[in-house]
């Protein structure tokens, strides 16, 4: 798979492949995988990809299921790149406060918060 | 501050306090703080709170600015609790695939993706 494929297209294709291979993947129904108990997915990327690794190790490879796991590994690569960009630029307090305000604003409007 | 205050109310109050104390906080013009270069805030919580720590150590405490940093520390506590909940429940493959599909769906529709 060329890594040049836009990440948005990669995500779309992966969703389709996940749907296609669901029956094969759930064949190992006794396997236990960490499933986050909330919907703030971005906080849980580490556990999600650990789970994908566990699932991959228990799934017979070949054909397009291999493409599914390759795609997921490219998505992980993209996310790891995004995480690196969290601390790359050191800027003035002003810019930091803008970002903090934005973060709290998103938390206020978009996060699923259980008290 | 009672930790019993709902997190959603805490976030709202913190946004207001941040606005109130902005002038005081930006007084330190030479300070440099890491600012993420993308808008997927949840991926950067560690860096955001490190930045808050840096800012707190450089800010004269007292009055409601102290309350701002106390609030931010409670928000960090909440997020740390959410992160713990990422791996607490180890469930069947079926539930994991539901979560993965949801995660990719959110990534597809809500993330700010630069290719």
């Amino acid at each position: 798979i060329p890594t040049e494929i836009p990440t948005s297209a990669l995500v779309k294709e992966t969703l389709a492949l996940l749907s296609t291979h669901r029956t094969l993947l759930i064949a190992n129904e006794t396997l236990r995988i960490p499933v986050p108990v909330h919907k703030n997915h971005q906080l849980c990327t580490e556990e999600i990809f650990q789970g994908i690794g566990t699932l991959e190790s228990q799934t017979v490879q070949g054909g397009t299921v291999e493409r599914l796991f390759k795609n997921l590994s490219l998505i992980k690569k993209y996310i790891d790149g995004q995480k690196k960009k969290c601390g790359e630029e050191r800027r003035r307090v002003n810019q930091f406060l803008d970002y903090l305000q934005e973060f709290l604003g998103v938390m206020n409007t978009e996060w699923i918060i259980e008290s | 501050i009672p930790t019993e205050i709902p997190t959603s109310a805490l976030v709202k109050e913190t946004l207001a306090l941040l606005s109130t104390h902005r002038t005081l906080l930006i007084a330190n013009e030479t300070l440099r703080i890491p600012v993420p270069v993308h808008k997927n805030h949840q991926l950067c919580t560690e860096e955001i709170f490190q930045g808050i720590g840096t800012l707190e150590s450089q800010t004269v405490q007292g009055g409601t600015v102290e309350r701002l940093f106390k609030n931010l520390s409670l928000i960090k506590k909440y997020i740390d609790g959410q992160k713990k909940k990422c791996g607490e429940e180890r469930r069947r493959v079926n539930q994991f695939l539901d979560y993965l599909q949801e995660f990719l769906g959110v990534m597809n529709t809500e993330w700010i993706i630069e290719s």
């Epitope: 129904e29 006794t30 396997l31 236990r32 960490p34 108990v37 566990t54 | 909940k85 791996g87 607490e88 429940e89 180890r90 469930r91 069947r92 539930q95």
Partner: antibody, heavy 111, light 107 residues
Framework: ESGGGLVQPSQTLSLTCTVS????????VNWIRQPPGKGLEWMGL???????DYNSAIKSRLSISRDTSKSQVFLKMNSLQSEDTAMYFC??????????WGQGVMVTVSS | DIQMTQSPASLSASLGETISIECLAS??????LAWYQQKPGKSPQLLIY???SLQTGVPSRFSGSGSATQYSLKISSMQPEDEGDYFC?????????FGAGTKLELK
Amino acid sequence: ESGGGLVQPSQTLSLTCTVSGLSLTSNSVNWIRQPPGKGLEWMGLIWSNGDTDYNSAIKSRLSISRDTSKSQVFLKMNSLQSEDTAMYFCAREYYGYFDYWGQGVMVTVSS
Amino acid sequence: DIQMTQSPASLSASLGETISIECLASEGISSYLAWYQQKPGKSPQLLIYGANSLQTGVPSRFSGSGSATQYSLKISSMQPEDEGDYFCQQSYKFPNTFGAGTKLELK
């Protein structure tokens, strides 16, 4: 745990686990049993969201439910036989391990 | 189901002696293994989780090790309060399964 004691063969067992200091909506509760002088057998659990998972060996006879307002988890098992004689424990699961256990309740199946 | 084979079934140790209990899984369990201690008439108590992490409040003389299918619990200096039954448990797959237990006695 409560509800133990003597149960007639073929009857239904009903046990209650009352939890204190833990919220059922953010904790998973398991049932585990131990026949006299023997090892431990995992029976099933109720997840924090109310979903259940059972040991396939006894799944057809077992039902786990809860009342979150009373902080209680219930176990119902039908068609009891002498081999169901055991100490029954409820336990909190965390990352797949059982870190808080009830004191246990003895169930004897006999006519 | 994953079978957990524990050995020995019973063990007698002197005060201060180092003892080891083994647990063999019928397939790889990726270190999803716990050890419990149970005293007569009491509930089991979690000692070790994740194959080698010590549960809070458990004395440091207890340690766990192993990977894949082979795991062990070590008590570095036997104490009178260590008497009891010890069980291993896997949580890699459903159903969670336990070893048959090891009875540890003081000589």
